[in-house]
């Protein structure tokens, strides 16, 4: 579809005569008839197969034609066609005299013709005007012409329909040849596919408009290149979606179980050495002079009554010192300078000579001890507290301070951690030295069987086309990560195949 345009520029009829030579009265009121037809080697009368157009009266005798004539005429003249431009044509231009206002052919006498020109040739579609001048004995006509495509038609012969558009069926303008030229940010045969944000991951990201990057399930980040770890993952990371790979020192399904309590909490005091002994479990090895589960208690070395024979004990920075009573010496006042003659045995103890009187030994009554029966019996010396309990003298009696997990007068009873039924979902409880352990039924895990173990939704290999399957543990479902070229929740559909038309 296009338009043959004819621009009349100047008509010269100096003598004001008709083709017959007869003059016009009072002058030649001139209008034009144009006939456009298919190419003929010799232009002959017949149907104007490409179209016809007439002008109003444009002037008298000799005149120039303005670009857009008044009186309803148009210059250039338009001869539209609704077919492929063949590249060749024949053109007939007739100048007529109009004695009255009726310009219809049947209303004019045959001898009203002023002049007739006929040309033919090749003409390519284009914006440039071809200038021509035709001269007869009495007249001269100067004109130009061209063929241009109608709006939305393109190509060498105006046969390609193309309408620029900017909606979801295409974002493009039309090139001179009728091919599509995508608007910035769009691609594809019909420019309907957006160009995603630069760097947007090919498989894990997509977009619905240019410079966007929307993430497929299991991925996050500006470029959709960061996996989303399992929901609830505390101290872990992932390399593929829904994973929870624990950081060092953490364990469990959600990496929320502390396997390195020593580093994370530093429970041991006073420079003690900490050893991890299980989940949230540790042992402190105390430096000399300290005691307690966390070595939080300062130990007085005089508490063990190291001084013998009534010596008095003094705590010192680096240990202790015994102040001995008269007649005794040594680190613990263990050596005597006395004999039985000095009555060294207290509290009714009886003295026995030894080494020909050079030494002696006291035989103490019940409840007294010491080399001179000077001490009441320390009920803790026999280490009566079992399971690492700490013995404390309390006047005439003694008391055991038990370690966690033990009870009874002598810490001889193991506290059953299982007594309060800590294992959930029917788990079986086992007492251990350092706590308890739950044996979980199928489908549950965790320290207390509190975690519902996800069924492996990937076990049935639901993903097609070599896609990678991930189990979404929070919903017991699977997510397929598609290889390039496939889409669908199971990656079952190829992308970008040529459309299959129904005809």
């Amino acid at each position: 579809s296009g338009v043959f345009q004819l621009q009349l520029q100047e008509f010269i009829n100096e003598r004001g005569v008709l083709a017959s030579g007869r003059p016009c009265e009072p002058g030649c009121r001139t209008f034009f008839r144009v006939c456009l037809k298919h190419f003929q080697a010799v232009v002959s009368p017949g149907p104007c197969t490409f179209g016809t157009v007439s002008t109003p009266v444009l002037g008298t005798n000799s005149f120039a034609v303005r670009d857009d004539s008044s009186g309803g005429g148009r210059n250039p003249l338009q001869l539209p066609f609704n077919f492929t431009w063949p590249g060749t044509f024949s053109l007939i231009i007739e100048a007529w005299h109009a004695p009255g206002d009726d310009l219809r052919p049947e209303a004019l006498p045959p001898d009203a013709l002023i002049s007739k020109i006929a040309i033919q040739g090749s003409l390519a579609v284009g914006q440039n005007w071809l200038l021509d001048e035709q001269t007869s004995t009495l007249t001269r006509l100067r004109y130009s012409y061209r063929v241009i495509c109608s709006d939305n038609y393109y190509g060498d012969n105006c046969s390609r329909l193309c309408k620029k558009r900017n909606d979801h069926f295409g974002h493009y303008v039309c090139q001179p040849d009728g091919n599509l030229s995508c608007l910035p940010g769009w691609t594809g045969e019909y420019c309907q596919q957006p160009i995603c944000l630069s760097g947007c991951h090919e498989q894990n990201g997509y977009c619905s408009k240019p410079a966007e990057c929307l993430c497929r399930p299991g991925w996050q980040g500006r470029l959709c290149n960061e996996c989303i770890p399992h929901n609830g993952c505390r101290h872990g990371t992932c390399s593929t979606p829904w994973q929870c790979t624990c950081d060092e020192g953490w364990g469990g399904l959600f990496c929320d179980q502390d396997l390195n309590y020593c580093t994370h909490h530093s429970p041991c005091k006073n420079g003690a050495t900490c050893s991890n002994s299980g989940q949230r479990s540790y042992t402190c090895t105390c430096r000399p002079g300290y005691t307690g589960v966390d070595c939080e208690l300062e130990l007085s070395e005089c508490d063990s009554n190291p001084c013998r024979n009534g010596g008095s004990c003094k705590d010192q920075e680096d240990g202790y010192h015994c102040l001995c009573p008269p007649g005794y010496y040594g680190l613990h006042c263990e050596h005597s300078t006395l004999s039985c003659a000095d009555s060294p045995c207290f509290n009714g103890g009886s003295c026995r000579e030894r080494n020909q009187g050079a030494n002696y030994a006291c035989e103490c009554p019940p409840n007294f001890t010491g080399s001179n029966c000077e001490k009441k019996v320390d009920r803790c010396t026999s280490n009566p507290c079992a399971n690492g309990g700490q013995c404390l003298n309390r006047g005439p009696s003694r008391m055991c301070r038990c370690r966690p997990g033990f009870t009874g007068t002598y810490c001889e009873l193991h506290v059953s951690d299982c007594a309060r039924n800590p294992c959930a979902h029917g788990g079986t409880c086992h007492d251990l030295e350092n706590g308890l352990m739950c044996t979980c039924p199928a489908g549950f895990s965790g320290r207390r069987c509190e975690v519902r173990t996800s069924i492996d939704a990937c076990a049935s290999s639901p993903c097609f086309n070599r896609a990678t399957c991930y189990t979404d543990l929070s919903t017991d479902t699977f997510v397929c990560n598609c290889p390039y070229g496939f889409v669908g929740s199971r990656c079952e559909f190829p992308v970008g195949l040529p459309p299959s038309f129904p005809w």
Epitope: L161, D167, H168, P494, L497, P499, P502
Partner: antibody, heavy 121, light 106 residues
Framework: EVQLQESGPGLVKPSETLSLTCTVS??????????WGWIRQPPGKGLEWIGD???????YYNPSLKSRVTISVDTSKNQFSLKLSSVTAADTAVYYC?????????????WGQGTLVTVSS | SYELTQPPSVSVSPGQTASITCSGQ??????ASWYQQKPGQSPVLVIY???KRPSGIPERFSGSNSGDTATLTISGTQPMDEADYYC?????????FGYGTKVTVL
């Protein structure tokens, strides 16, 4: 041969939500050459375009219905769905699903047979 | 909102030419499609991109579109062509249908 089949309840109460599903067979809903649309026709009246969806999930709605319409796609089932909330008697119509072809300038070359939805208490 | 206007009805004798117009602002700058719908049936695409015919559509159906008017022409109309005809175009991202024209073959 591509075929489209609408399914869903034929009777919906006023103020409730109308829900329809279109199942596509004989072709993939994930083709980049097509959008998948919903059109309705009240009894004795003309056609009204409701909206459409691309396989990626991009949606386009008629501005006059936008506040009430949701269209979604399930590529694994080769289906797309329509939800129209807060319905009134004026929403009584035959609802069609159709394939809109990008190579045809957006012309709908395949249609479902249509399903009549009546809004009445 | 964008509107497409069609005459409510067109009557034609068998064998004659029926022309249905569809008017909208600058419609010639958009692609027009035409659908035929017979009673109790789904619409059928008969013309797309102004003047192209899908396979299986008879040659007697033709279309044109320029200025503000698209036209569907049925040459040598047959009784089986009696139906409702709808024009359709896209305004930005919204599909718009004409009000429909009932073609009666006398």
């Amino acid at each position: 041969e591509v075929q489209l089949q609408e399914s869903g309840p034929g009777l919906v109460k006023p103020s409730e939500t109308l829900s329809l599903t279109c199942t596509v067979s004989g072709g993939s809903i994930s083709s980049s050459s097509y959008y998948w649309g919903w059109i309705r026709q009240p009894p004795g009246k003309g056609l009204e375009w409701i909206g459409d969806i691309y396989y990626t999930g991009s949606t386009y709605y008629n501005p006059s219905l936008k506040s009430r319409v949701t269209i979604s796609v399930d590529t694994s089932k080769n289906q797309f769905s329509l939800k129209l909330s807060s319905v009134t008697a004026a929403d009584t119509a035959v609802y069609y699903c159709a394939r809109e072809a990008v190579p045809l300038g957006g012309g709908s070359d395949y249609w479902g047979q249509g399903t009549l939805v009546t809004v009445s208490s | 909102s964008y509107e497409l206007t069609q005459p409510p009805s067109v009557s034609v004798s068998p064998g004659q030419t029926a022309s249905i117009t569809c008017s909208g602002q600058r419609l010639g700058d958009k692609y027009a499609s035409w659908y035929q719908q017979k009673p109790g049936q789904s619409p059928v695409l008969v013309i797309y991109e102004d003047s192209k015919r899908p396979s299986g559509i008879p040659e007697r159906f033709s279309g044109s579109n320029s200025g503000d008017t698209a036209t569907l022409t049925i040459s040598g109309t047959q009784p089986m062509d009696e139906a409702d005809y709808y024009c359709q175009a896209w305004d930005r991202d919204t599909g718009v249908f004409g009000y429909g024209t009932k073609v009666t073959v006398l």
